[in-house]
Every structure is written in C-alpha cells, then in structure tokens.
Interface confidence: low
C-alpha cells in the first residue's frame, strides 16, 4: 500500500530513509539535458523474497540533443500523486541490510539522473530526520516517522525534531522559509523496533548518512 | 501513561515571586523539549517559555524576557519556572506541555493568581 | 510576532452538520499550523498538526487544510461532544502563537 502523502516536514531539516521497503517505487528522472530513453522505465521498484531484496528495472537517461522531439517529462502513475523528494546523498553508504530483511538498499546512481530523487514510500516505512547545516537538533537522539496505516487511511507519525540556529540565543528560528513541519514527543505508536547495528549521533548520519537502523524506545 | 503534574500555583502580590514546578512521569523527560504555555482568564493562549531537552536552549516571549526563567531538573524529571516581578498581567492558568511546539502532552493546569 | 486572527469567534451549530473554523495569519506560516480542541475546565488537546495531519485518537470526522496565510478546520459532522473552544497555533516563527479562539455551541 503506498503512502498518500509525504513525510511530515520540520523547519530547518531533511529527511532520509536508510533502506526501503519492498515496494517502494523511485521515480527515473533525468537531469537537464537529459531523458529517459523512450523504453526504458518509469521508476524503479524495490521487490524480494523472504531472503533477498533488490531493485526491479534499471534507470536509463539519454541526451536529449540525441532527438529533435520534444523534451520527454516523465509521466507518474495514475495513483501516485504525492511525491516524495529527497536530496541525493554523496557519498552513500548503505544500510546493511542483514538486518532489514524485506528492504532494499540505497539505489545505485544511473548516468545523468536528477539532482533529486523521487521516492514513493509504502506503508511500515521509516525516514530519519536531520537538521540542515547551520542548525542544531535541540533533542537528543533520533527523530524518526514511520508510515502508518490507520483506519485505512496512511498518515506518518511525528518525528521529535526542533532544529535551531547555531548561533542563536534568543530568537527562535522561523523568519526565513523553513524548509520543511510538525515536531513534538512520539506519538505512541512511533515505538517501532527495528534491529540496530550502531548508531552514532545524529550529526554524523548527517555528515555520511552511514548510520544503520536502529532500535528506538518510546519515550 | 504520561502525566504531567503542575504545582506552586496561588495568589501572588505585584512584585513578588513564584516558582512553578511540573512533575512529569510516563516518558523519557530527558529526551524531551518542555514548555509554559499560560490562558488569563477567559481569555486566549500564550507561549510562554520554551526549553531543549538539556536545558541548554530558552527561549521567553518577549513581554516575560528577564522576569521569568524556565529550568528543569532531568534527574528527576522535573520542569519549572521561576517567576519575578511578577504583574497583574500575569494573572493566568499556566500549562506544562512536552515537545515543544506541538503541544502534544498537557498537564491540568496551576492558577496563579497576582493581585494587591 | 505573528497575529492569527480565527474567525468566526463564536458558532452555533447542529448535531450532524459540518463545521468550518478559519484561521489566518498576518504572515505566512509554511503550513506549520496546529489545531487544538479545549473543553470547559479542561486542558487543551492537540486535533491536527502539520496543517493536515490528524493526532492519533483524533475522530476522523475532524481535519485540517489550508497554506500561506489561510487555514480550515473542519468537523465532517457535529456530534455532542464537540462543543468547545478551537484554537489555531503556528510555529513557524517563535513565539508561537495562538488565534483568539472560536466558540462551538449547539444549537
């Protein structure tokens, strides 16, 4: 089932997801200049069995000065309305994913792939947040949402994240466009285990974003 | 279940002092940002004052800046506000909320009351 | 600081009948909005978050829209139990701040 929506924003953060669940779909988009070649797919899909994960289709870009047609916008599936943007992260390491089975890996990059990548998350996923440079989190630990299927409808839980300026004492950030939304304690039903490697502090993930998944308690 | 438990509230003179405390149980109080939030009778809500989970970061709206202090005590989970000089405009129902701008968690609310 | 000005400041409505409360900013708040329900004597508790997101345990009969500046709380249907007074809150800039307040009565 996918996600309805995007992952809630925060003020002065991104987002990220260490690994994806089977059936995550992530959009083949080209940079500027460039194209999907005419057969190539429209997205890639994570898909698996009980003892493997791995991403169907493989993205392909070609020039767009190659043809004398128009430049070619990659149509989205019907029921795909929201779409989930994320940063392209480099250099990424990959989750290990022994100890997410089920999951995909980060995917590989294709030539000439946008700038941006396009995810569209299915219900159980999680996505790690963290504040941009500049800013610190003014919590501790992990600031995490998990897509949720709640009385058939899908809605992300609330990551605890506030992230303010450095060098601020007493004014609270907020008067440039944050970049992204709601911050508070975890809703109850945030306290999703998964199995943990290591998880250094949060301000190494942002630097590498090498961090494994790890265990959360709900406070 | 979390709970949060306001106490220290009363009648108060003009200028003299207060402090309120919020007893919190059910979560990891050190993990957490803590705020004041405060409703004068019949009337709206404020923010009052705000405080990261290591009480490193405060933060005051302006009209209470250099009259109150926010702190917390994480051994034993405790948040609290010192309140001076206070003002009749003080008079208020004040709340301890978790998470900071969400409001997500409230305790019941203390009355403090600053009248001559 | 920003001014959230809720209108209407009191309703009257009947069981079953949908209920819009507006909420407008004097600046823009990024869709980082809050709705809050505050029953007599009570506490107040957090409906929506995010604009649009309903708090978990929240009835589905209550939701949240808008961006820039204008903001919606809705109740799909009215029941008894929603008599109260609503607030709007932003957090885009601090101090957050909070709207007046919209009266719910039954009619």
């Known amino acids: 089932e996918l996600c309805d929506d995007d992952p809630p924003e925060i003020p002065h953060a991104t987002f990220k997801a260490m690994a994806y669940k089977e059936g995550t779909m992530l959009n083949c988009e080209c940079k500027r200049g460039f194209r999907r070649i005419k057969s190539g797919s429209l997205y890639m899909l994570c898909t698996g069995n009980s003892s493997h994960s791995s991403w169907d289709n493989q993205c392909q870009c070609t020039s767009s000065a190659t043809r004398n047609t128009t430049k070619q916008v990659t149509p989205q599936p019907e029921e795909q309305k929201e779409r989930k943007t994320t940063e392209m992260q480099s250099p990424m390491q990959p989750v290990d994913q022994a100890s997410l089975p089920g999951h995909c890996r980060e995917p590989p990059p294709w030539e000439n792939e946008a700038t941006e990548r396009i995810y569209h998350f299915v219900v159980g996923q999680m996505v790690y947040y963290q504040c941009v440079q500049g800013y610190r989190a003014l919590h501790r630990g992990p600031a995490e949402s998990v897509c949720k299927m709640t009385h058939g409808k899908t809605r992300w839980t609330q990551p605890q994240l506030i992230c303010t300026g450095e060098m601020e004492t007493s004014q609270f950030p907020g008067e440039e466009k944050p970049q992204a939304s709601p911050e508070g304690r975890p809703e109850s039903e945030t306290s999703c285990l998964v199995t943990t490697t290591d998880f250094q502090i949060q301000t190494e993930m942002a630097a590498t974003m090498e961090t494994s998944i790890f265990t959360t308690e709900y406070q | 279940e979390v709970q949060l438990v306001e106490s220290g509230g009363g009648l108060v003179q003009p200028g003299r002092s207060m402090k309120l405390s919020c007893a919190v149980s059910g979560f990891t109080f050190s993990n957490h940002a803590m705020a004041w939030v405060r409703q004068a009778p019949k009337k709206g809500l404020e923010w009052v004052a705000y405080i990261s989970y290591d009480g490193d970061n405060t933060y005051y709206r302006d009209s209470v800046k250099g009259r109150f202090t926010i702190s917390r005590d994480n051994a034993q989970s405790t948040l609290y506000l010192q309140m001076d000089s206070l003002r009749s405009e003080d008079t208020a129902t004040y709340y301890c909320?978790?998470?900071?701008?969400?409001?997500?968690?409230w305790g019941q609310g203390v009355m403090v009351t600053v009248s001559s | 600081d920003i001014q959230m000005t809720q209108s209407p400041s009191f309703l009257s409505a009947s069981v079953g009948d949908r209920v819009t409360i507006n909420c407008k900013g004097s600046?823009?708040?990024?869709?980082?909005l809050n709705w809050y329900q505050q029953k007599l004597g009570e506490a107040p508790r957090r409906l929506i978050y995010?604009?649009?997101s309903l708090q978990t345990g929240i009835p589905s009969r209550f939701s949240g829209s808008g961006s820039g500046t204008d903001y919606t709380l809705t109740i799909s249907s009215l029941q008894p139990e929603d008599v109260a007074t609503y607030f709007c809150q932003q957090y885009t800039s601090w101090p957050w701040t909070f709207g007046g307040g919209t009266k719910l009565e039954l009619k």
């Open positions: 600046q823009n708040v990024n869709k980082f």
């Open positions: 995010g604009t649009n």
């Open positions: 909320t978790t998470g900071g701008n969400s409001g997500y968690d």
